[in-house]
């Protein structure tokens, strides 16, 4: 018996087609993805093959203005239209709190939403009861297939699930649910979830009875043969893991942003054992036409986005200096504003010993693309912020050793004075540079804001300590020459859309007045260029 699994993960609000790098589509003939194009391909496969499931491994929420405006209603609407068969909860589904998940998505989805390792307690337990399930048995042709869901147990550090959801260890939580499915005589079981490729592989290895793992969170691209676009495969598709009980378990993921549709064919014997598995992600490029009816619906929903982007979010009473003359040479107040917003967006009081789990932010000055003039009645709009942050990136959470941070700050000024983008803006960090010293030895003071303290204060950076830092995904991926971050990071979790983070902060503060306040200093008077 053959099953076709179509799967997406980490779509992050890419409802419309995008450019090849998943940013805004400029030249339509070269654009990719989007729900209208995805629907065309899904329908084509559904018509051609008998036993097809369309699954999503989480993080539909967060990533473009679509989510900012529609807050998840767009996810329910278009996933319903595409007739998804099941979805696992990702960490970003909790970005607007539990209510922001329940009302727009859980109550409106016409498909089951799954997670076995999230347990509700207190008053939330009865409220959320039945709105997501640990597993779902799906009818496929004359057979049944069990789908068990899982979600990153780091979600309380990455999003806003509140205090009444407990995120258990994935493997511990999955095993009893799989065992239960086995007692119900369900002999074909897919683990569908959002904990990253390393955990996907562990689940394949450790959870007895799981036949296939369909994952997300780490944006992992797997491919067998010559890859069709820019993504470099992390391994073959499917990635085969030998389980502790000797079975070959296929593990798949489909990169991110709806650029690919994962396509996996599994052959089962009559006892539900996997005999063979093969496939590849399908690149959703312009050779696949956009479905006209879904496209028309997208265009209808788009109208509200255009209106939103010109509305006032808040006001500034000072000039927001995002000029390259400032932000690539010295502390600029636009950099301070953005870093303050990044930290504010990551406030999570999950431990009494810590005022927050993260206090530091770094931001490449080259990523700040425009100032905002306060002489327009102080008004700040989404449109203004899109000029400051035009690349459609995210502000991510990483863990780095102090020694890596030191290297990053040396890189920040290794060729100072040439107006290059690697000059770092900061938050929760005080740095002093001496430009009279040779490149690689210019950081003379680097103090960082404590987290395990009731009164935050600045302490010298410790080389062997592990620190959490919020930074643009561009830097986490080694952009602007920050190869040391990419090579040495100990953990990387994708965060919220950059513009959304800043816009939320401005809306919250109502009136802003960021200052230049001595976060970045130069000794020996080398701060004039």
């Amino acid at each position: 018996w053959e099953l076709t699994i179509l799967h997406t993960n980490d779509v992050h609000s890419r409802l419309e087609q995008t450019s090849e790098d998943s940013s805004k589509c400029v030249n339509a003939s070269r654009c990719m993805g989007g729900v209208a194009r995805l629907f065309t391909k899904v329908q084509q496969i559904r018509r051609a093959e008998p036993n097809v499931l369309l699954l999503d491994a989480g993080d539909q929420y967060q990533g473009t203005i679509w989510f900012t405006v529609y807050k998840g209603a767009e996810v329910a609407h278009f996933m319903n239209a595409l007739r998804y068969d099941a979805m696992a909860l990702g960490n970003h589904e909790f970005d607007n709190g539990v209510e922001g998940l329940i009302e727009p998505l859980l109550k409106e989805a016409k498909f089951p939403i799954l997670s076995a390792n999230i347990k509700a307690k207190g008053p939330l337990a009865s409220q959320i009861s039945g709105l997501y399930l640990p597993y779902k048995v799906l009818p496929v042709g004359d057979e049944v297939v069990g789908i068990v869901g899982y979600t990153s147990k780091e979600t309380p550090f990455l999003s806003n699930p509140g205090t009444n959801l407990v995120f258990e260890d994935e493997i511990t939580a999955l095993q009893p649910e799989v065992d239960k499915l086995k007692t119900l005589n369900v002999n074909k079981i897919i683990a569908l979830g959002h904990s990253g490729f390393e955990m996907d592989k562990l689940i394949a290895q450790k959870v007895r009875g799981v036949d296939v793992v369909v994952g997300g969170h780490s944006n992992t691209f797997l491919y067998t043969g010559n890859p069709p676009s820019k993504e470099v495969p992390a391994g073959k598709y499917p990635f085969i893991v030998t389980s502790d009980d000797g079975r070959k378990v296929p593990v798949v993921q489909a990169y991110a942003f709806g650029k690919y549709l994962g396509y996996l064919k599994i052959e089962f014997d009559e006892r539900g054992n996997v005999i063979s598995s093969h496939g590849n992600p399908i690149l959703l490029n312009s050779s696949i036409p956009e479905d006209p009816s879904i496209k028309a619906d997208i265009n209808k929903w788009r109208i509200k986005l255009d209106n939103y982007s010109t509305q006032e979010l808040g006001k500034t009473i000072v000039y927001l200096d995002g000029s390259s003359q400032s932000c690539r040479f010295r502390e600029c107040n636009m950099g301070n504003l953005i870093c303050d917003a990044m930290i504010n967006n990551n406030l999570r009081h999950t431990d009494e010993m810590f005022w927050n789990h993260v206090s530091m932010c770094i931001l490449n000055g080259g990523g700040i693309r425009s100032p905002i003039d306060e002489r327009n009645n102080g008004t700040i709009t989404w449109e203004n912020l899109a000029a400051v942050l035009p690349f459609g990136g995210t502000f991510d959470l990483v863990q780095l050793k102090g020694s890596t941070l030191k290297k990053a700050f040396e890189h920040s000024v290794h060729r100072y004075g040439q107006s290059t983008g690697e000059f770092l803006q900061v938050g929760g960090i005080h740095v002093v540079y001496d430009l009279s010293r040779k490149p690689g030895d210019r950081v003379v003071k680097l103090d960082v804001l404590c987290t395990k303290c009731r009164v935050p204060s600045y302490d010298p950076l410790k080389m062997d300590e592990v620190y959490k830092v919020i930074l643009p995904n561009f830097l986490a991926n080694g952009g602007d020459g920050f190869q040391m971050i990419k090579d040495e990071l100990l953990r990387h979790d994708s965060g919220d859309q950059d513009i959304n983070v800043v816009s939320t902060y401005i809306s919250k503060m109502k009136v802003i007045y960021p200052a230049v306040e001595g976060r970045i200093k130069f000794s020996h008077h080398h701060h004039h260029h």
């Epitope: 989805a109 016409k110 498909f111 089951p112 039945g130 399930l133 009818p139 049944v144 369900v186």
Partner: nanobody, 126 residues
Framework: QVQLVESGGGLVQAGGSLRLSCAAS????????MGWFRQAPGKERVFVAA????????TYGDSVKGRFTISVDNAKNTLYLQMNSLKPEDTAVYYC???????????????????WGQGTQVTVSS
């Protein structure tokens, strides 16, 4: 909270009629299959009838065909089971069930249903 609440059960003479209702709340059911199952004392739970919430396609268990009619009122979010020509062997606790949506399904495999009511007792006396 997803809830299915049955009502309408009771004691009835053989040959009589009853109409069971099941009020569904807490989420959309528009791509769900809704079903009625029953369980007689000391017996397994068995399938009675099912209906697609949208479209209204139906299917019935062999023992009730021609006597029972399943229906939904979308506006009231309510499932019904009209039971005519009742027999003593129809005596059971009747459960309303629903799927969480997903693939098209119309049938009686109870493991494919995700939500269950508490049940309502139907007793048919001879």
């Amino acid at each position: 909270q997803v809830q299915l609440v049955e009502s309408g059960g009771g004691l009835v003479q053989a040959g009589g009629s009853l109409r069971l209702s099941c009020a569904a709340s807490g989420r959309t059911f528009s791509r769900s299959t809704m079903g009625w199952f029953r369980q007689a004392p000391g017996k397994e739970r068995v399938f009675v009838a099912a209906i697609r919430w949208i479209g209204g396609t139906t299917t019935y268990g062999d023992s009730v065909k021609g006597r029972f009619t399943i229906s939904v009122d979308n506006a009231k979010n309510t499932l019904y089971l009209q039971m005519n020509s009742l027999k003593p062997e129809d005596t059971a606790v009747y459960y309303c069930a629903a799927t969480a949506g997903g693939p098209y399904y119309l049938g009686g495999r109870d493991i494919l249903y995700d939500y269950w009511g508490q049940g309502t007792q139907v007793t048919v006396s001879s």
